[in-house]
C-alpha cells in the first residue's frame, strides 16, 4: 500500500507521458488520477516505468475498478498484465479476441503462466465454446494448448474448429484427449476424398476405433510406423495380420524394429504364428 499524501504543487499529471518516470512512487499515487490513467492506458507501454512504478499504477486501477477492469482498459494493459494475479483476472469479462491477442503478445515466448491460463479460461468460458478463430489464436501462441485441456473441456470444441489444428498441436495429447478429438475430426473431414482425408485425420488416429482402422486398411493409405505406434491398444488388438499388412503397406517392415514396444508387442502376442510368418519378418508371437 502506498501512503496517501497530497500532490506537490505543479505536479498534477494532465496526461500520461514520459515525465512520470521521474515521479517517486508516492508522487505517482498522489498526482496521477486513476480515471486519466484508465483512458490513456495505451500510453503506459511506451513509457519505461520501473516495476515499482507499475505496482502503483496497478493499485490505482484496482481502486477505480474494485469489481474488475472494463475491457477498454484490459485491452491496453500491455506489460501491466504481467503484474496481474489470477485472482485479479477472474474478475474480468474478456469477450474480444483482439484483447486476448494483445495480452498473449505480452507473454509471448514464455511458458503459459497461471495468469495466461486464467485469462484463456475466462475467455473460453465467456464464449461458451472453443471456436475456430480462438483455437487458431491460442495454438499460434501455445502449440501445446489443446493438449493442456481436459477431455471434458475438449468436448466443447466444435468439429468446425478442428480445421485449425496442426499435427504439432497434438504432440502432447494423451489417449483420453484423442478419444474426444477423433470423432470431431472424423466429422470435420468427412467430405474429403480418401488420400486427402487420411492426410488430415492421421494426427487424430490415436483415438480411432478398430472398425475405422479396418476401413482404412482397405484404402491403400500406407500408414507410417510412428502413427501406428500411437494407435489405441484396444483398437489394434483385433486387427488381423492381413489388415495390418494392408494398413501399413510398405511400412510393414518397420514392425520388426518395434516388436518389443507397445502396441506392436501386444498385437504380435495375440496373433497365430503361422499368420505372422506370412510377413516374413521373423516376428515371434
Amino acid at each position: 500500500e502506498v501512503e496517501k499524501t497530497a500532490c506537490p504543487s505543479g505536479k498534477k499529471a494532465r496526461e500520461i507521458d514520459e515525465s512520470l518516470i521521474f515521479y517517486k512512487k508516492w508522487e505517482l499515487e498522489a498526482c496521477v488520477d486513476a480515471a486519466l490513467l484508465a483512458t490513456q492506458m495505451d500510453r503506459v507501454n511506451a513509457i519505461p516505468f520501473t516495476y515499482e512504478q507499475l505496482d502503483v499504477l496497478k493499485h490505482k486501477l484496482d481502486e477505480l475498478y474494485p469489481q474488475g477492469y472494463p475491457e477498454s482498459v484490459i485491452q491496453h494493459l500491455g506489460y501491466l498484465f504481467l503484474k496481474m494475479s489470477p485472482e485479479d483476472i477472474r474478475k474480468w469479462n474478456v469477450t474480444s479476441l483482439e484483447t486476448l491477442k494483445a495480452l498473449l503478445e505480452v507473454n509471448k515466448g514464455h511458458e503459459m503462466s497461471p495468469q495466461v491460463a486464467t485469462l484463456i479460461d475466462r475467455f473460453v468460458k465467456g464464449r461458451g465454446q472453443l471456436d475456430k478463430d480462438t483455437l487458431d489464436t491460442l495454438t499460434a501462441f501455445y502449440p501445446g494448448y489443446l493438449c493442456s485441456l481436459s477431455p471434458e473441456e475438449l468436448s466443447s470444441v466444435p468439429p468446425s474448429s478442428i480445421w485449425a489444428v496442426r499435427p504439432q498441436d497434438l504432440d502432447t495429447c494423451d489417449p483420453r484427449q484423442l478419444d474426444v478429438l477423433y470423432p470431431k475430426a472424423r466429422l470435420a473431414f468427412q467430405n474429403m476424398n480418401g488420400s486427402e482425408y487420411f492426410v488430415k485425420i492421421q494426427s487424430f488416429l490415436g483415438g480411432a476405433p478398430t472398425e475405422d482402422l479396418k476401413a482404412l486398411s482397405q484404402q491403400n493409405v500406407s500408414m507410417d510406423l510412428a502413427t501406428f505406434m500411437k494407435l489405441r491398444t484396444d483398437a489394434v488388438l483385433p486387427l488381423t495380420v492381413a489388415e495390418v499388412q494392408k494398413l501399413l503397406g510398405p511400412h510393414v517392415e518397420g514392425l520388426k524394429a518395434e516388436e518389443r514396444h507397445r502396441p506392436v508387442r501386444d498385437w504380435i502376442l495375440r496373433q497365430r504364428q503361422d499368420d505372422l510368418d506370412t510377413l516374413g519378418l521373423g516376428l515371434q508371437g
Partner: antibody, heavy 119, light 107 residues
Amino acid sequence: QVQLQESGPGLVKPSETLSLTCTVSGGSVSSYHDLWSWIRQPPGKGLEWIGYIYYSGSTNYNPSLKSRVTISVDTSKNQFSLKLSSVTAADTAVYYCARDNVFTGFDIWGQGTMVTVSS
Amino acid sequence: DIQMTQSPSSLSASVGDRVTITCRASQSISSYLNWYQQKPGKAPKLLIYAASSLQSGVPSRFSGSGSGTDFTLTISSLQPEDFATYYCQQPYDASYTFGGGTKVEIK
C-alpha cells in the same frame, strides 16, 4: 473378483532352484487381455520385474535374469509358475505374482511370499 | 533397456499438502506410464495407468500427467492413508522397468 495366491518354499539353498506357483481364482489364466507376471522386491529395496507369460505359452523375461528364469503356465490348473536357477543370497526377496492387464497395468497382485536364500 | 528415474527419492509432507512426484524415462515411452502405491508389508496397488487414467476405486485426489519422457504424479491434498512409497513403471518396452521409488513420510 480375480485373486492371486503365491505358494512355494520360503527357504532355498544357494546354487539350487527357486520354484514358486501362482494360483488364479475368480478368473481365467486363459484371458485374452491379460499377461501373468512375476515381480520381486529385495528387503528394503525397490520392485524388479522378472518376466511374464501369456496363456499361449509365449514368455518374456528381464534381460538381467533371462539365463536363469523359466516361467510356465498350466491352463488346466489355472496356475503359472516361476523357476529361478542357481540362486544366491542376492535373490532373497518377497516374490509377487501379478496380472498385467493390457489396458491398465499390474492391476491385481498376490500378497507376496518371502523367499530367503541361505544355507 | 529403458531406465526410469524418480525424484525425489523421499519427501516429508503434512496432511493437506499438495505433493508432486516426477518420473523421467531414458527414452520416449509415449503415454505408457503407470504409478503404484505400496505400504509396508503390502503388495503394490495400481493408481494411475496410461500416464493420466485413474484406476477404478482410486480417490480423485490422485492425478497423473506427462508424455514422452517426463511424467508427474500429483496428490492434490495429502491424506493420512497416503503416506507410502510410490513407484512409476513403464510397460512400453518389453523390459518393464520400475523407478526407484519415492517414499512420502509425515513431516
